[in-house]
C-alpha cells in the first residue's frame, strides 16, 4: 500500500494547526514539564515490517484523535482550529485504515506488533492521567500539546522511512 502524498501533507498541516492552537505563553509552564516516556522505539521503522509500522501509525493517530475529541479538549482550545485539526487526523485515519486492510492481507502481523500498539496506548494513558492529575489546567494542556507535536513529528519521520522502503 502506498500512502498518498496527501497523507504526509495532512500530517504537516496537522502539526501546523497544533502549533497554532496555543492559548497561553508556554514560557509560564516550565515547571509543569513531565516525562511521558514516549515509546521512541515504536517509531523506529527499521525494526518493523510495513504492516506493523502502519498499525503503529494508525494507533498513534487514533489516540491523538481521541485525546482531542473530549469535552475537556473542546473547552481548552479554540473551536475552529480544533475542528480543522481533528479533520486532518480523521483523513489520515482513513488513509491508514485502507492500508492496514491491504497490508495485513499480505503479511501476518506477529505478536510483537500487539506489544507496540500496547506501548502506544500506555503512553496515551500516561498523558490522560497527567491531565487528570493537573485538573486539565491551561499549562497541563500546553505541555500535552508540546508532547503531541513531538510524537506527531516522530510519526512523520516514520512515514518518510516507510516511503523510502517502497
Amino acid at each position: 500500500c502506498d500512502l498518498p502524498q496527501t497523507h504526509s501533507l495532512g500530517n504537516r498541516r496537522a502539526l501546523i494547526l497544533l502549533g497554532q492552537m496555543g492559548r497561553i505563553s508556554p514560557f509560564s509552564c516550565l515547571k509543569d514539564r513531565h516525562d511521558f516516556r514516549i515509546p521512541q522505539e515504536e517509531f523506529d521503522g527499521n525494526q518493523f515490517q510495513k504492516a506493523q509500522a502502519i498499525s503503529v501509525l494508525h494507533e498513534m493517530i487514533q489516540q491523538t484523535f481521541n485525546l482531542f475529541s473530549t469535552e475537556d479538549s473542546s473547552a481548552a482550545w479554540e473551536q475552529s482550529l480544533l475542528e480543522k485539526f481533528s479533520t486532518e487526523l480523521y483523513q489520515q485515519l482513513n488513509d491508514l485504515e485502507a492500508c492496514v486492510i491491504q497490508e495485513v492481507g499480505v503479511e501476518e502481523t506477529p505478536l510483537m506488533n500487539e506489544d507496540s500498539i500496547l506501548a502506544v496506548r500506555k503512553y496515551f494513558q500516561r498523558i490522560t492521567l497527567y491531565l487528570i492529575e493537573r485538573k486539565y489546567s491551561p499549562c497541563a494542556w500546553e505541555v500535552v500539546r508540546a508532547e503531541i507535536m513531538r510524537s506527531l513529528s516522530f510519526s512523520t519521520n516514520l512515514q518518510k522511512r516507510l516511503r523510502r522502503k517502497d
Epitope: G19, G22, S25, P26, F27, S28, C29, L30, K31, D32, R33, H34, D35, F36, E142, V143, R145, A146, E147, M149, R150, S153
Partner: antibody
Framework: EVQLVQSGAEVKKPGESLKISCKGS????????IGWVRQMPGKGLEWMGI????????AYSPSFQGQVTISADKSISTAYLQWSSLKASDTAMYYC??????????????WGQGTLVTVSS | DIQMTQSPSSLSASVGDRVTITCRAS??????LNWYQQKPGKAPKLLIY???SLQSGVPSRFSGSGSGTDFTLTISSLQPEDFATYYC?????????FGQGTKVEIK
C-alpha cells in the same frame, strides 16, 4: 549534526547599535527555543532571555528587559540579539543555546561558540 | 526570582579524588536543575539535566542528585580533563538563574 553557529567578534563604541546572530542547523529550528546567556570577563553565566522561533514569542530576564531585543527569522533558522545603544558594561561573551521548550528533554544541550562583544571608546 | 547558591566557590583536588559540589535554591524547584561544565575560552557543556539524568556522551563518573532545594554534583574519580568551572542552573521557572560557579583546581 546539530550546530549553533554564532556571528564573529565585534568591537563597538558606546552609543552604537549592534545585532549578533545564531544560526541553527541539523535539527528542526522551530521545535526548540533559543536562549541567550551573557558572561562578563572573569564572571559567571547570566541568562538574558529566550525566544520561541515558531511564533517569535519572547521572555526576558528582568535584568535585561528593555536593554536588549531578541528576535528570530525561522526562514533562515537564525536567532538574533540586538542593542540599540551599547554601553561599556555590555562588554562580554554572549552565547546562544537551544532549549527543548515544554518537552521532557535536556535543557541547553547545544551551545554556540560565543560572540565576544567589546565596547570601548 | 529564584536564587541559586553554590558551594564551595572553589576547591583544590587531586586526580582520583571524589569531588562534591552543592547547589541550593532559594525555593523548591522540584527536580528542575541542570549542571554545566565550562573550560576557559569554551562554551558551557551540559553534564546533568533534571537533577540526575546524565547527558548523552558524558562520562559516568559524573552524577547528580537531590530535589526540592538541595542538589549535589559528584565526580567519583577526578580526571585531568575535569579541572574546570561548574555551574548549576534552575530550570523550574523564568527567569532562569545560574549559581555563581565552582572552580575545580589542581592541588
Amino acid at each position: 549534526e546539530v550546530q549553533l553557529v554564532q556571528s564573529g567578534a565585534e568591537v563597538k563604541k558606546p552609543g552604537e547599535s549592534l545585532k549578533i546572530s545564531c544560526k541553527g542547523s541539523g535539527y528542526s529550528f522551530t521545535s526548540y527555543w533559543i536562549g541567550w546567556v551573557r558572561q562578563m570577563p572573569g564572571k559567571g553565566l547570566e541568562w538574558m532571555g529566550i525566544i520561541d522561533p515558531s511564533d517569535s514569542d519572547t521572555a526576558y530576564s528582568p535584568s535585561f528587559q528593555g536593554q536588549v531585543t531578541i528576535s528570530a527569522d525561522k526562514s533562515i533558522s537564525t536567532a538574533y540579539l540586538q542593542w540599540s545603544s551599547l554601553k561599556a558594561s555590555d562588554t562580554a561573551m554572549y552565547y546562544c543555546a537551544r532549549h527543548p521548550g515544554l518537552n521532557w528533554a535536556p535543557d541547553f544541550d547545544y551551545w554556540g561558540q560565543g560572540t565576544l562583544v567589546t565596547v570601548s571608546s | 526570582d529564584i536564587q541559586m547558591t553554590q558551594s564551595p566557590s572553589s576547591l583544590s583536588a587531586s586526580v582520583g579524588d571524589r569531588v562534591t559540589i552543592t547547589c541550593r535554591a532559594s525555593q523548591s524547584i522540584d527536580e528542575f536543575l541542570n549542571w554545566y561544565q565550562q573550560k576557559p575560552g569554551k562554551a558551557p557543556k551540559l553534564l546533568i539535566y533534571f537533577a540526575s539524568s546524565l547527558q548523552s556522551g558524558v562520562p559516568s563518573r559524573f552524577s547528580g542528585s537531590g530535589s526540592g532545594t538541595d542538589f549535589t554534583l559528584t565526580i567519583s574519580s577526578l580526571q585531568p580533563e575535569d579541572f574546570a568551572t561548574y555551574y548549576c542552573q534552575q530550570a523550574h521557572s523564568f527567569p532562569l538563574t545560574f549559581g555563581q560557579g565552582t572552580k575545580v583546581e589542581i592541588k
